[in-house]
């Protein structure tokens, strides 16, 4: 059951009159402009800055008073400022959304350590995985390693956005007091939507006697 709570002074459930709400979008995916209304009888117009008005055709663009405008496969045309407008009792109300295109491009993934990694037993392992992407890309970075089931590693993540051309994502894996069971393959996996890249390195553990 969906209940509308009619409010003549507020046709939109969420109003972003001054600062637009940012909506992340991916080309080819569904995009929802969430200008749902307080009454199903309110007529809403979707405008694209600067000079266009989108026409819901029931096919690619659907109007649903409980959700807003649903664009089944977003294109570059929907990138930018979109405004939902409604006139109630002669008063024009607007709510603004800024669509931000997320790409799924992963430019490069590296583990910044010599390969293979040679380490003394009892010492600390630090592996730094670096993913480089275009500015409007977000990634998920995960690690797989030999003693993963015991959650031996701690992982810290950060992002460097100081570069004007790319985002650099860091995932730093640390394991204290390395033991023989920690030797083996360490893999950093980077995913952005359907895109996927991985990099791995071998870690060898040595006793002091063999150095």
């Amino acid at each position: 059951i969906y209940i509308f709570i009619s409010d003549t002074g507020r046709p939109f459930v969420e109003m972003y009159s001054e600062i637009p709400e940012i909506i992340h979008m991916t080309e080819g995916r569904e995009l929802v402009i969430p200008c749902r209304v307080t009454s199903p009888n309110i007529t809403v117009t979707l405008k694209k800055f600067p000079l266009d008005t989108l026409i819901p055709d029931g096919k690619r663009i659907i109007w649903d008073s409980r959700k807003g405008f649903i664009i089944s496969n977003a294109t570059y045309k929907e990138i930018g400022l979109l405004t939902c407008e409604a006139t109630v009792n002669g008063h024009l109300y607007k709510t603004n959304y800024l669509t931000h295109r997320q790409t799924n491009t992963i430019i490069d993934v590296q583990i910044s350590t010599p390969r293979p990694v040679k380490l003394l037993r009892g010492h600390t392992l630090v592996l730094n995985c670096t993913a480089t992407t275009p500015l409007n890309t977000r990634v998920q970075m995960t690690w797989s390693y030999p003693d993963e089931k015991n959650k031996r590693a701690s992982v810290r993540r950060r992002i460097d956005q100081s570069n004007s051309h790319a985002n650099i994502f860091y995932s730093v894996l640390t394991i204290d007091k390395m033991q023989n069971k920690d030797k083996g393959l360490y893999t950093c996996r980077v995913r952005s939507g359907p895109s996927f890249k991985s990099v791995n390195t071998s870690v060898h553990i040595y006793d002091k006697a063999f150095i």
Epitope: T43, T45, L51, D52, T53, L54, I55, G58, K59, W63
Partner: antibody, heavy 121, light 106 residues
């Protein structure tokens, strides 16, 4: 008063091309979505093409997709329909219509008087 | 695509009488139904939108109703100027017109 005046209709051979125009006045043309609708000899109405107010989006039924192109010149308050690879079944009266928002979706609310297109050898 | 079945295709009525036309859509049209009057040599005229809402300036003897897939349009107290062809339109999924109903005087 809203006025839509179509022109450009003619007798054309199968496979030929034709460009229809629609001059609009009495409303803010640049803020209105527009459509072309045709009436076939058996008096049935068929939607042919739609364009958004700024011209970024166009819509066509499968029957004309790839053969017809709708466009507009907002500076001249004029709507166009370029028709190519014409077939005898394209013979019709072509109407230009303004779209109005009625409940979130758009219906044709003002129509011109039409221009006649005959495709025959 | 949505199909529209309009009936009857023609209809004879007396002045002062009442006529009803129906349109059935092949899928739920969510009340996005419009009705038009069309006279020879002119463009169609929008009478009703959203199934039952009368356009400004249209006499109240015209009315529309319905929901889901079934919609109807009526003219009561028929007047001479009402003699025309009437069409329904669904505008929920692209645009599809009914086949039309030619209204004649009995």
């Amino acid at each position: 008063e809203v006025q839509l005046v179509e022109s450009g209709g003619d007798l054309v051979k199968p496979g030929g091309s034709l460009k229809l125009s629609c001059a609009a006045s009495g409303f803010t043309f640049s803020s209105s979505g527009m459509s072309w609708v045709r009436q076939t000899p058996d008096k049935r109405l068929e939607w042919v093409a739609t364009i958004t107010s700024g011209g970024s989006y166009t819509y066509y039924p499968d029957s004309v997709k790839g053969r017809f192109t709708i466009s507009r010149d907002n500076a001249k308050n004029t709507l166009y329909l370029q028709m190519s690879s014409l077939k005898s079944e394209d013979t019709a009266m072509f109407y230009c219509a303004r779209l109005g928002n009625y409940g979130g979706y758009y219906a044709m609310d003002y129509w011109g008087q039409g221009t006649s297109v005959t495709v025959s050898s | 695509d949505i199909q529209m079945t309009q009936s009857p295709s023609s209809l004879s009525a007396s002045l002062g009488g009442k006529v009803t036309i129906t349109c059935t859509t092949s899928q739920d049209s969510n009340n996005y139904i419009a009705w038009y009057q069309h006279k020879p040599g002119k463009g169609p005229r929008l009478l009703i939108h959203y199934a039952s809402t009368l356009q400004p300036g249209i006499p109240s003897r015209f009315s529309g109703s319905g929901s889901g897939r079934d919609y109807s349009f009526s003219i009561s107290n028929l007047e001479p100027e009402d003699i025309a062809t009437y069409f329904c339109l669904q505008y929920d999924y692209l645009w599809t017109f009914g086949g039309g109903t030619k209204l004649e005087l009995k």
